[in-house]
Amino acid sequence: EVEKTACPSGKKAREIDESLIFYKKWELEACVDAALLATQMDRVNAIPFTYEQLDVLKHKLDELYPQGYPESVIQHLGYLFLKMSPEDIRKWNVTSLETLKALLEVNKGHEMSPQVATLIDRFVKGRGQLDKDTLDTLTAFYPGYLCSLSPEELSSVPPSSIWAVRPQDLDTCDPRQLDVLYPKARLAFQNMNGSEYFVKIQSFLGGAPTEDLKALSQQNVSMDLATFMKLRTDAVLPLTVAEVQKLLGPHVEGLKAEERHRPVRDWILRQRQDDLDTLGLGLQGGIPNGYLVLDLSMQEALS
């Protein structure tokens, strides 16, 4: 808290300009009118204030707007945004994507801070859903943004927004998140032809069910091993050796290197050894020839 002192003669700020960088904290408090500051916020970011000076300017705005800043001020906060607490931001009503971009720009190159997370949360809740333009903006600044959302939050992403998602945006997503995103991606890309469709859907396949993987195996897609290793284990297990061979195409040779890792390991345990031998890769651990395989889950379903 800066104590109240009279502004020295001739120092009363007539406008927000670079002369203010020479003011001590108490002079800024005493000589800068909060209403003037609010109307000339667009100038603040161009002036190289220290964080101590920005603290004083924030204090003045807080006094002027105890219920939260108007968007006209928020849009021009610039470096002053770094001084805001999540509690401050929860009072805001941010509706303009331009405002969001301006504030994300200030934090560019840094990890997502609690302030930024709160800002995004306020913005998305205000819009009601994560539309394409917003998602475009957020993933441009924070490629991992999508994977930071809960499955419940992801359910508000409309399929049309999926077009904005890049493969790297999904790098840190877990299977639960991909389970939500995959059906949306399938819907978004449904009108594309085979090879183009696969290129787009590939990063979302960690959420694909068995029947979709079977369908893909009929389309000569040549899935790479990295993608295969991210598939849901429960979706891979029912695939036959022939289906996996068709799905992977020339990449099928990579199974050998991954035979001890899921989902390959678990899939091998479910295949007949003589079927695995047809691949000529030396995969071991399949069901020995002559053994009868009972699918108990199917039996339970029938009874």
Epitope: G10, E18, I21, F22
Partner: antibody, heavy 117, light 109 residues
Framework: QVQLVQSGAEVKKPGESLKISCKGS????????IGWVRQAPGKGLEWMGF????????NYSPSFQGQVTISADKSISTAYLQWSSLKASDTAMYYC??????????WGQGTLVTVSS | DIALTQPASVSGSPGQSITISCTGT?????????VSWYQQHPGKAPKLMIY???NRPSGVSNRFSGSKSGNTASLTISGLQAEDEADYYC?????????FGGGTKLTVL
């Protein structure tokens, strides 16, 4: 166009006084600060101090505080750097530069000051 | 008493890319985005090449770019040309004071 024109080279003896100038044109002289920067022969740039001409606010580098005085006459858009008693170690090129947003975006051509007995 | 540390010299062949570093502290380069870079040819005044870490003034070639990581700012020059041979200085502002780096001599081989 925006430019800063500095006064000519000076040759002085130790103990003498000197005032060099920097005249701004092509922009609003009062709303930008002016910095002075020293470059000794074969050396790097050293910031000496600033002035904000509109209000004559100044700030000096601790290395130059008390050694030089920076002033301005906004009526003729000119900033000054002066010494009351020169030393041989003051021999250097002196640049004035326009300051904005934490950077020096326009520079004068430099004034060479030689102090020698 | 230089607060910002730069390599004394760097060199590169035409067409190559080079990077000049400028290391300060958390209270200058680290905390603030007020880092600038200047080019100075022999006998000439310095010229602003980059301001506020990564912004180029109009008229400066896009071969020059700036960045910052932690307490270190960097100037990268891509597609090196003979005319890039000069001294380069970084500058950090913590208002109302500023400091320059010691300078880096760039030689184009």
């Amino acid at each position: 166009q925006v430019q800063l024109v500095q006064s000519g080279a000076e040759v002085k003896k130790p103990g003498e006084s000197l005032k060099i100038s920097c005249k701004g044109s092509g922009y609003s002289f009062t709303t930008y600060w002016i910095g002075w920067v020293r470059q000794a022969p074969g050396k790097g740039l050293e910031w000496m101090g600033f002035i904000y001409p509109d209000k004559s606010y100044t700030n000096y580098s601790p290395s130059f505080q008390g050694q030089v005085t920076i002033s301005a006459d906004k009526s003729i858009s000119t900033a000054y750097l002066q010494w009351s008693s020169l030393k041989a170690s003051d021999t250097a090129m002196y640049y004035c530069a326009r300051g904005l947003g934490g950077s020096f975006d326009v520079w004068g051509q430099g004034t060479l000051v030689t102090v020698s007995s | 008493d230089i607060a910002l540390t730069q390599p004394a010299s760097v060199s590169g062949s035409p067409g190559q890319s080079i990077t000049i570093s400028c290391t300060g502290t958390s209270s200058d380069v680290g905390d603030y985005n007020y880092v600038s870079w200047y080019q100075q040819h022999p006998g000439k005044a310095p010229k602003l090449m980059i301001y506020r870490v990564d912004n180029r003034p109009s008229g400066v070639s896009n071969r020059f770019s700036g960045s910052k990581s932690g307490n270190t700012a960097s100037l990268t020059i891509s597609g090196l040309q003979a005319e890039d041979e000069a001294d380069y200085y970084c500058q950090s502002w913590v208002g109302p004071s500023t400091v320059f780096g010691g300078g880096t001599k760039l030689t184009v081989l």
